[in-house]
């Protein structure tokens, strides 16, 4: 039994780091392997993570961490019974993948304006809470070419757009993801998408203009 692709880990900078790796053949990750991890610091404690399968030869482990600070460094030992398959280290602050935003809602009751709001995935006492920026993806269910990204570079988890920038009378979906420049993070996963029917009253001049053609 050998490791084909060494573990790579990302941290949500809150309580969970996720490590993935591939073995050289089909493996029952949860019965055959254990990932031991320990903070490199005075009087720290060794923890054991039981991996799950992630495809035939792939394994994934969710490492629980009480808290994360930028100096944290963990040793990682991958064991198959009494055999040490791989030894490495992981610094969570250097491999951050934020949690996905949640509760995406589209408010269509503001006149001719779409207000999209979502929730910051971190509590206010987490360092990332005040450092997230977002990307909002809106697309048409009817027209694959009607696909757009709005970058939200301010801290407020909301986006206002004129309903008229989208086509009227058709359904759209939206989703949002986050990243934090301060830790040069990767993007989070996309939030679950939400759907709405885009309809707005065109201005009178436009109606008038249409009647003359």
């Amino acid at each position: 039994m050998k490791v084909l692709q060494e573990p790579t880990c990302v941290s949500d900078y809150m309580s969970i780091s996720t490590c993935e790796w591939k073995m050289n053949g089909p493996t029952n990750c949860s019965t055959e392997l254990r990932l031991l991890y320990q903070l490199v610091f005075l009087l720290s404690e060794a923890h054991t993570c039981i991996p799950e399968n992630n495809g035939g030869a792939g394994c994934v482990c969710h490492l629980l961490m009480d808290d994360v600070v930028s100096a944290d460094n963990y040793t990682l030992d991958l064991w198959a019974g009494q055999q040490l398959l791989w030894k490495g280290s992981f610094k969570p602050s250097e491999h951050v993948k934020p949690r996905a935003p949640g509760n995406l809602t589209v408010h269509t009751n503001v006149s001719d304006t779409l207000l999209l709001t979502w929730s910051n995935p971190y509590p206010p006492d987490n360092y990332l809470y005040n450092h997230l920026t977002y990307a909002v993806n809106i697309w048409s269910e009817n027209d694959p070419a009607d696909f757009r990204i709005y970058n939200v570079t301010y801290l407020e988890p909301s986006l206002r757009i004129a309903a008229s920038t989208l086509k009227s009378g058709i359904s759209y979906r939206a989703r949002v993801r986050a990243w934090a420049q301060c830790y040069n993070t990767t993007w989070s996963e996309w939030s679950p998408s939400t759907k709405w029917h885009n309809s707005y009253r065109e201005p009178f001049e436009q109606h008038h203009h249409h009647h003359h053609h």
Partner: antibody
């Protein structure tokens, strides 16, 4: 809410030993470190040492290495500190303080045990 | 041992004042700097850990900053319950050491 309850005040003669206790109201004692810090009357704070109750690992301030002994009883979530060869300058309030395992900040403190060393 | 020097050793301030306490380490402590509040006859309480992290339940008027050897505790608007003694502590190098304290008194 985590609580640390320490044993009562002690009066000792120079050269004697004292053993004090600290009971923690935590679900699992092994996920923490128990440290001991003292404060002489009107003075600042001084770290004595720390213990990982799960594996028994200890770390001491060299100043106390030969006189302080830290132990724990996992079954009762209780930590102990024994200080030997007492002298008058050991008169102080002794605090137990809890950190998450491997952390360097004292998140929870006991109410303190006053130890008076006097002939 | 790393020496932790707090300044001032005492200060007088009024409710609503902005108060700043500094702590200087004798060598780089890599942000392992914590702040505690202590009232007479009571145990210390953790306010800020790892330079700037607010401990749970601590009001947001308390904040911390700094790096290397120089660190600061700021109380943005002093409240009556904030009159106490404040200690810094480094947890980077054994033995862990504390500053001498700053007593915040009512003006």
């Amino acid at each position: 809410q985590v609580q640390l309850v320490q044993s009562g005040a002690e009066v000792k003669k120079p050269g004697a030993s004292v053993k004090m206790s600290c009971k923690a109201s935590v679900y699992t004692f092994t996920g923490y470190n128990m440290h001991w810090v003292r404060q002489a009357p009107g003075q600042g704070l001084e770290w004595i040492g720390g213990l990982h109750p799960g594996n028994g690992d200890t770390s001491y301030n060299q100043k106390f290495k030969d006189r302080a002994t830290l132990t724990a009883d996992r079954s009762s979530n209780t930590a102990y500190m024994e200080l030997s060869s007492l002298r008058s300058e050991d008169t102080a309030v002794y605090y137990c303080a809890l950190t998450t395992a491997g952390r360097a900040w004292f998140a929870y403190w006991g109410q303190g045990t006053l130890v008076t060393v006097s002939s | 041992d790393i020496q932790m020097t707090q300044s001032p050793s005492s200060l007088s301030a009024s409710v609503g004042d902005r108060v700043t306490i500094t702590c200087r380490a004798s060598q780089d402590i890599s942000n392992y700097l914590n702040w505690y509040q202590q009232k007479p006859g009571k145990a210390p309480k953790l306010l800020i850990y790892y330079t700037s992290r607010l401990h749970s339940g601590v009001p947001s008027r308390f904040s911390g900053s700094g790096s290397g050897t120089d660190y600061t505790l700021t109380i943005s608007s002093l409240q009556p319950e904030d009159f106490a003694t404040y200690f810094c502590q480094q947890g980077n190098t054994l033995p862990w050491t504390f500053g001498g304290g700053t007593k915040v008194e009512i003006k």
